[in-house]
């Protein structure tokens, strides 16, 4: 009786089951009643990343330095290669074809994640207390000056984008 | 036999431009990825460039990026470096190696060619 | 760029005396895709060109004695030779071969004592 499945690492072919290529190689020629699956190594800068049957290997991606990327990790005969973008860039999808200059979070807000070579600069509106006077891919939400603590008194109040002023107490009552 | 022959080393002024030969034989070249690798008199080793086995990937050492050229010629086993602007720094002897689809190493060098930049 | 530290420089040692050396690596060699660490180690004697000695950290090319041994992962390897022999006099490399650019140690030469 013919099997109509076929264990781990094999498949169903004319009625039998033949073993899978192994990562890193391609599939030749199926198996037979009398013969074994024949696979052969992927070539230079390609690659087959599971257990197979296909009959052509996959070409490792180009990090491509006029795209802004880098490599992050090499590519082998049993993985892609992965891209990364330099510095100051970050990769616009997730499978890392191009990269943009991340943003700058304007005045009136901080940074609150630094962006990396994968992901944007994420930003965040200052809260009452905090100001951001610059446009900055760096810089947090800084705290207002305190005049208390420097024997002053507000002058005029701060805002999200600018600081307080602090001036003399005035001493006329 | 894997045999891998480096010519075109030579003694050029600073500003000057050079091009290096890799001759392959005793394996099929069109197979396997190749390196430039460089070592300066006395010192260690530092990769240069890497070409893939069918021209599609090229990478370069910051280094050399903007002045130096790998290619190759896969009808006639060879692959080159083309160094343009060469400074002192570049004196070095310079190596070709190649990467196979398997190990992903360098497996087999050549024995070298001197470029020596100096006024 | 990964940066790559060979200690020590140099060490000078007795025939059938064990050597080791030390290659760490400012990040991690490991590719996540097929777990292994793509360390490399080359051998260069005295007016040769390198010759590859160990693949993968611890896979030795063919044709190498099995005096000579890899191991370590992550950031951290070691080049063992078990028993000194007068032909392994010679200037050893260790190398990232995980990203580019590739990157070498500063090489470590071993002598007879």
């Known amino acids: 009786e013919p099997p109509t499945a076929c264990r781990e690492k094999q498949y169903l072919i004319n009625s039998q089951c033949c073993s899978l290529c192994q990562p890193g190689q391609k599939l030749v020629s199926d198996c037979t009643e009398f013969t074994e699956t024949e696979c052969l190594p992927c070539s230079e800068s390609e690659f087959l990343d599971t257990w197979n049957r296909e009959t052509r290997c996959h070409q490792h991606k180009y990090c491509d330095p006029n795209l802004g990327l880098q490599v992050q990790q090499k590519g082998t005969s049993e993985t892609d290669t992965i891209c990364t973008c330099e510095e100051g860039l970050h990769c616009t999808s997730e499978s890392c074809e191009s990269c943009v200059p991340h943003r700058s979070c304007l005045p009136g807000f901080g940074v609150k994640q630094i962006a990396t070579g994968v992901s944007d600069t994420i930003c965040e509106p200052c809260p009452v207390g905090f100001f951001s006077n610059v446009s900055s891919a760096f810089e947090k939400c800084r705290p207002w000056t305190s005049c208390e603590t420097k024997d002053l008194v507000v002058q005029q109040a701060g805002t999200n984008k600018t600081d307080v002023v602090c001036g003399p107490q005035d001493r006329q009552r | 036999e894997v045999q891998l022959v480096e010519s075109g080393g030579g003694l050029v002024k600073p500003g000057g431009s050079l091009r290096l030969s890799c001759a392959a034989s005793g394996f099929t070249f069109s197979d396997y990825g190749m390196h430039w690798v460089r070592q300066a008199p006395g010192k260690g080793l530092e990769w240069v460039a890497y070409?893939?086995?069918?021209?599609?990937?090229?990478y370069y050492a910051d280094t050399v990026k903007g002045r130096f050229t790998i290619s190759r010629d896969n009808a006639k086993n060879s692959l080159y470096l083309q160094m343009n602007s060469l400074r002192a720094e570049d004196t070095a002897v310079y190596y070709c190696?190649?990467?196979?689809?398997?190990?992903?190493?360098?497996?087999?060098w050549g024995q070298g060619t001197l470029v020596t930049v100096s006024s | 760029d990964i940066v790559m530290t060979q200690s020590p420089d140099s060490l000078a040692v007795s025939l059938g005396e064990k050597v080791t050396i030390n290659c760490k690596s400012s990040q991690s060699l490991l590719n996540s895709g097929n777990q292994k660490n793509y360390l490399t180690w080359h051998q260069q004697k005295p007016g040769q060109p390198p010759k590859l000695l160990i693949y993968?950290?611890?896979t030795r090319e063919s044709g190498v004695p099995d005096r000579f041994s890899g191991s370590g992962s992550g950031t951290d390897f070691t080049l063992t030779i078990s028993s000194l022999q007068a032909e392994d006099v010679a200037v050893y490399y260790c190398q990232n071969d995980y990203t580019y650019p590739l990157t070498f140690g500063g090489g470590t030469k071993v002598e007879i004592k």
């Open positions: 993968w950290t611890s």
């Open positions: 190696a190649r990467q196979d689809g398997y190990r992903y190493a360098m497996d087999y």
């Open positions: 070409i893939s086995s069918g021209n599609r990937i090229i």
